[in-house]
């Protein structure tokens, strides 16, 4: 009765696939992660605009900091 | 490996149309978008637009809007660009570059399109 | 649109030299900035992504790093090949936009 599945989202012009999990599997936090990890092969990469996607790990670091 | 094969230079008169194409291989074509650029002989890059894969929609930059389309045929993981009207101006190298995590990150080599009477 | 301010427009420098060149942000973009190196035969291949990650096989000797909204491309010891042109893009917000180049010449 654990299951976790991915679905598309829809943001701005891209898509970008997000993990919508099952609120049981919440509860076993490592097995979460390891399928999240699974999952990662349906990420796409649509906008080339880091600020229309979610894709992205967006940067805001401010003053040079890093 | 991943790679953007583009077809051959074309040379082109006043008022053609011209389509190059972009064949992607080593990765899933729908899954990244794919971007256009534009080199003037001895000028920089411009960003044309990009296609997003999945849902064939055109995004095309403000200077790029009325004669250029952006199409795919995914059977056959190709994108291409149509130049419609052609005109001197639009003698240009033409790249294609996917859409990667942090922009785009690969590259086609390039089309040279000359336009000239 | 941002505007990139990339200078030097040219540079002749040695082999074994140390150079770098910058790139200048007319608004915040954060760290969402890419160098590329362009070959004679127009062959583009992306060197430095998110202001200071190498993509992989690109040689050490590159580096990228930012102060403020300046970034900046390092090459430490300049080596035959690294003669061509090069080129920073955002890719923070829409219209992606290019500094207008660098062209490293060998001394």
């Known amino acids: 009765f654990l299951f976790h599945y991915s679905k598309t989202q829809k943001l701005g012009k891209s898509n970008v696939v997000s993990s919508v999990v099952h609120p049981l599997l919440q509860l076993v936090p490592h097995l979460h992660e390891r399928r999240m990890k699974r999952f990662r092969v349906d990420e796409e990469f649509q906008s080339p605009f880091a600020s229309q996607s979610r894709g992205y790990f967006l940067f805001r670091p401010r003053n040079g900091r890093r | 490996q991943i790679q953007l094969v583009q077809s051959g230079p074309e040379l082109k008169k006043p008022g053609e149309t011209v389509k190059i194409s972009c064949k992607a291989s080593?990765?899933?074509?729908?899954?990244?978008?794919m971007n256009w650029m534009k080199q003037a002989p001895g000028k920089g890059l411009k960003w044309m637009g990009w296609i997003n894969t999945n849902t064939g929609e055109p995004t095309y930059s403000e200077e790029f809007k009325g004669r250029f389309a952006f199409s795919l045929e995914t059977s056959a993981s190709t994108a291409y660009l149509q130049i419609n009207n052609l005109k001197n101006e639009d003698t240009a190298t033409y790249f294609c570059?996917?859409?990667?995590?942090?922009?785009?990150?690969?590259w086609g080599k390039g089309t040279s399109v000359t336009v000239s009477s | 649109d941002i505007q990139m301010t990339q200078s030097p427009s040219s540079l002749s420098a040695s082999l074994g030299e140390r150079v770098s060149l910058t790139c200048r942000a007319s608004q915040d973009i954060g760290s969402n900035l890419n160098w590329i190196q362009q070959e004679p035969d127009g062959t583009i291949k992306r060197l430095i992504y998110?202001?200071?990650t190498l993509d992989s096989g690109v040689p050490k000797r590159f580096s990228g790093s930012r102060s403020g909204s300046d970034y900046f491309l390092t090459i430490s010891s300049l080596e035959s090949e690294d003669f061509v042109d090069y080129y920073c893009?955002?890719?923070?917000?829409?219209?992606?936009?290019f500094g207008a180049g660098t062209k490293l010449e060998l001394k």
């Open positions: 080593g990765y899933t074509f729908t899954k990244h978008g």
């Open positions: 998110a202001t200071s």
């Open positions: 893009l955002q890719f923070d917000s829409s219209p992606l936009t």
């Open positions: 570059a996917r859409t990667g995590r942090y922009g785009v990150d690969y």
